[in-house]
């Protein structure tokens, strides 16, 4: 059943003498494996023998034996699906039909494949896109209906016989659907590629030429133009004539329209290849080009810069920058339309020529107020001298100048006075808009630039003002020189350095922090009594009687100031001790008697000791010695000793007499 055999392979294979053929082939024999395979060349069926006649190129049998002369032809297939064949080398007389005679256990089949072998390598075929346009990337394809594993080939692209720089991508196909070698070249043609010869060259593995295909490129492009001008330098004077000619060096397809443009704008009624400009004016200066269009689009020539020369026009001055800040740099630019450009300039400041200034720009590195004013200029070129334009005003701004702080009061100023100051300046641009004062205080500014200080303080030493426009300028501080009575008067002990003991030499100093004016007088006073007029009060040997409250006064022409009362304390050992007895020095037995040790001491007595008439110390240490009940035996002389941090003192003897009570006398 012949329908069971299914083959797939290329219908025709192409090669040339000495090359090889690789025949990709697959089959399916549904009733089992292949048992016999014969490759015929131009097979013909013999009805008599019911067999095929023809040259047997290859034969394989059940036992798998292959005659040795069949090495040129190889069956690379298998027994059930692959029927790939190779003929290497292939010869011219191999052209024709190849017959694949297949036999399985029960079925037979003859499959035919066409083989076309040429005498010489056949040329590849260049495939071009239907249209090639400049600057648009295209792919050129070179196709060769040949590929064989045993015969490597290469396809090379040439432009005008020179290998093309662009990299080509080569691919091969050896499948049951197709056998080919293909090279694809991507490139962006320019207009100059139009008419140029592109070749795809087939070479063997060693680069030897085998065959080629050639095409001449048809590259569609916008018109390519050349512009010519008379005079050739395109420099004329007003009133001259100019001719411009537009030449089309290449256009594909043919051009259709011509126009002329000046500075990018189309010139009306100028549609020929020649542009005639008669009696040109300076307004006709500019960039000219011609534009020619075809179906691809418009092409433009290079621009011709037509320069119509004329004497300078009235000039204007541009200032960078006005207003200018004093000390900054300023540049003046003289602007005058002229062709050729001016070669010489004359500059004027407030109508007076500025010597040595002949350039287009004037640069002043450090602007001063006197630079202000009107600047104008005159430009000059080979065709003449221009007129002086209106000029430009330079405004020089600067901080207020020569600022001073002025005291309006009569001098001297006394503490507590009301002081008025004014802030003055010499000049300012822009005008002064505000004033500042240092130091800051809760002061009144009755008018701009005037400061009123009510009840001026003794310590208001200096005041400075600033006059401000865009900047503030400070005056040097002015001294108020406020006069005041001596301040911070106080008594200070100079010696001794430690506490004052009776008998010490003592010096007291009358101190003050400040006084204006400086000339002062001193006064010492104790309990309202004047003690001295020096700054120091001295005691050669201080006594407790000198203790007390002292004050010193310092006065100047403005007034006098007293110190706080200062207490002078003299330390001394207990003195003037005496024993006083209560209720008296004669007490009845059985009653209570209190002895008190009285003393004068600084600091007060801290410790008392009592003694009897035998100088025997008693076990009592307080100021009072209480005897209760008193006995006759208590009669006798007593004395006490007082102790403080300075020393000790003792009292004289005091006699206590204890007499018998009437009861005792009565018993006796």
């Amino acid at each position: 059943d012949s329908s069971k055999w299914v083959f797939e392979h290329p219908e025709t294979l192409y090669a040339w003498e000495g090359a090889c053929v690789w025949i990709p082939c697959t089959y399916r024999a549904l009733d089992g494996d292949l048992e016999s395979f014969i490759l015929f060349h131009n097979p013909e069926y013999n009805k008599n023998t019911s067999k095929f006649d023809g040259t047997r190129l290859y034969e394989s049998t059940k036992d798998g034996k292959v005659p040795s002369e069949q090495k040129r032809v190889q069956f690379l297939g298998d027994k059930n699906k692959n029927c790939t064949l190779s003929i290497h080398p292939v010869h011219l007389n191999d052209s024709g039909q190849l017959g694949l005679r297949m036999e399985s256990k029960t079925e037979k089949w003859m499959e035919r494949i066409h083989l076309n072998v040429s005498e010489r390598p056949f040329p590849p075929h260049i495939q071009l896109p239907p249209e090639i346009q400049e600057s648009q990337e295209v792919t050129l394809t070179c196709l060769l209906n040949f590929s064989c594993y045993g015969y490597p080939i290469q396809l090379q692209w040439l432009l005008e016989g020179v290998p093309m720089r662009q990299a080509a991508v080569t691919s091969t196909s050896l499948t049951i659907k197709s056998v080919f070698t293909r090279s694809e070249l991507k490139f962006s043609p320019q207009w100059s590629h139009h008419g140029k010869i592109v070749t795809c060259q087939l070479q063997d593995a060693d680069g030897k030429f085998l065959s080629n295909d050639t095409v001449q490129l048809n590259v569609k492009h916008t018109p390519k133009l050349e512009i010519k001008v008379t005079p050739s330098d395109a420099i004329v004077r007003e009133g001259d004539s100019v001719t411009m000619t537009c030449e089309v060096s290449s256009s594909n397809p043919e051009y259709t329209t011509v126009s002329w443009l000046k500075d990018g704008t189309s010139l009306k009624k100028q549609n020929t290849f020649t542009l005639n400009l008669r009696e040109v004016t300076k307004d006709q200066s500019g960039k000219y080009c011609c534009q020619v269009s075809n179906d691809v689009g418009p092409g433009r020539s290079e621009e011709v810069f037509l320069q119509v020369q004329y004497a300078p026009e009235p000039s204007t001055v541009q200032i960078l920058h006005s207003p200018a800040v004093e000390g900054s740099q300023v540049e003046f630019l003289c602007m005058s339309l002229a062709n050729p450009l001016p070669t010489n300039y004359t500059w004027y400041h407030n109508g007076k020529e500025m010597q040595g200034r002949t350039e287009e720009k004037v640069h002043i590195p450090k602007i001063l107020p006197w630079h202000a004013g009107t600047y104008s200029c005159v430009a000059e070129n080979i065709l003449g001298t221009g007129q002086r334009g209106p000029g430009a005003e330079l405004d020089v701004q600067y901080p207020p100048k020569k600022v001073t702080t002025v005291i309006q009061n009569p001098m001297p100023i006394r503490e507590g006075d009301t002081v008025t100051l004014s802030c003055n300046y010499n000049s300012s641009n822009p005008s002064v808009t505000r004033y500042e004062w240092k130091p800051h205080g809760a002061w009144e500014e009755p008018s701009l630039g005037v400061l009123k200080i009510q009840n001026v303080g003794w310590d208001n030493t200096t005041i400075a003002c600033a006059a401000c426009n865009s900047w503030c300028s400070w005056a040097s501080p002015v001294a108020l020189n406020v006069q005041y009575a001596p301040r911070d008067v106080r008594v200070r002990k100079i010696k001794p350095l430690s506490e004052i003991h009776s008998g010490n030499s003592v010096s007291l100093q009358c101190d003050f922090s400040s006084s204006h004016p400086k000339e002062v007088q001193f006064f010492w006073e104790k309990n309202g009594r004047l003690l001295g007029k020096e700054s120091q009060l001295n005691f050669d040997s201080i006594s407790p009687e000198d203790a007390g409250s002292y004050s010193c006064w310092v006065n100047n022409s403005i007034g006098q100031t007293a110190s706080k009362a200062w207490t002078l304390e003299v330390l001394y050992a207990p003195r003037r001790l005496r024993v006083s007895m209560s209720p008296g020095d004669q007490v009845m037995e059985g009653k209570s008697a209190t002895l008190t040790c009285e003393s004068d001491a600084n600091p007060p007595v801290s410790h008392y000791t009592w003694f009897d008439w035998n100088n025997q110390s008693l076990p009592y240490h307080s100021q009072k010695l209480r005897l209760e009940p008193v006995k006759v035996q208590h009669s006798g002389a007593y004395w006490c000793q007082g102790t403080n941090s300075v020393g000790k003192g003792r009292s004289p003897l005091s006699t206590l007499t204890v007499y018998y009570s009437p009861e005792t006398i009565g018993r006796r």
Epitope: E160, G161, V162, S192, K196, I197, Q216, E247
Partner: antibody, heavy 109, light 106 residues
Framework: QVQLVQSGAEVKKPGASVKVSCKAS????????LHWVRQARGQRLEWIGY????????EYNRIFKGRVTITADKSTSTAYMELSSLRSEDTAVYYC?????????WGQG | AIQLTQSPSSLSASVGDRVTITCKSS????????????LAWYQQKPGKAPKLLIY???TRERGVPSRFSGSGSGTDFTFTISSLEAEDAATYYC????????FGQG
């Protein structure tokens, strides 16, 4: 080898048309453009135009625009140049020619 | 189109002389893709088709005697016969083939 063989001499009346042929051999006809050039007696060579036989694309010198038609027959590898509205100043030798990469091939005229 | 101007328009010389013809192009004929000038020189004798002598401005065609040479680039080209021979009497044309074809006046 490359050969370009042209048709013979023609005599025409003013206002008539003429069609000159150029048979190419020795190369792939569609690979190269075929140009036409003429030369009047004692005058310079003057390019008329070309045809690209691959796609029948033509380009003409503007001075012949509207009077000249160049065609090609791929089957016979022959190019034709037809000039209409003939004037006496069209009297000239007409050449077909083509480029090679380095050389140029000319018909006999 | 690109215009070519040849000079001189005619000249007389003796056998053995060195002869120079110039050809000026209105635009450059240098094809930058291959760095070659698309200018050719032809010799034409009466009743004959033009014969190619030089292509690419300076390359001699096969079989052309070495006394013929060409030089130049861009827009200015020179054709030289180093030692004139009697059979060199002819009209010589320059031709540009960068963009269509144009010929010098010969």
């Amino acid at each position: 080898q490359v050969q370009l063989v042209q048709s013979g001499a023609e005599v025409k009346k003013p206002g008539a048309s003429v069609k000159v042929s150029c048979k190419a051999s020795g190369y792939v006809f569609t690979s190269y453009w075929l140009h036409w050039v003429r030369q009047a007696r004692g005058q310079r060579l003057e390019w008329i135009g070309y045809i690209n036989p691959r796609n029948d694309y033509t380009e003409y010198n503007r001075i012949f625009k509207g009077r000249v038609t160049i065609t090609a027959d791929k089957s016979t590898s022959t190019a034709y140049m037809e000039l209409s509205s003939l004037r006496s100043e069209d009297t000239a030798v007409y050449y077909c020619a083509r480029r090679g990469i380095t050389t140029f091939y000319w018909g006999q005229g | 189109a690109i215009q070519l101007t040849q000079s001189p328009s005619s000249l007389s010389a003796s056998v053995g002389d060195r002869v120079t013809i110039t050809c000026k192009s209105s635009q450059s004929v240098l094809y930058s893709a291959v760095e070659k000038n698309y200018l050719a020189w032809y010799q034409q004798k009466p009743g004959k088709a033009p014969k190619l002598l030089i292509y690419w401005a300076s390359t001699r065609e096969r079989g052309v005697p070495s006394r013929f040479s060409g030089s130049g680039s861009g827009t200015d080209f020179t054709f030289t016969i180093s030692s004139l021979e009697a059979e060199d009497a002819a009209t010589y044309y320059c031709k540009q083939y960068l963009s269509s074809w144009t010929f010098g006046q010969g």
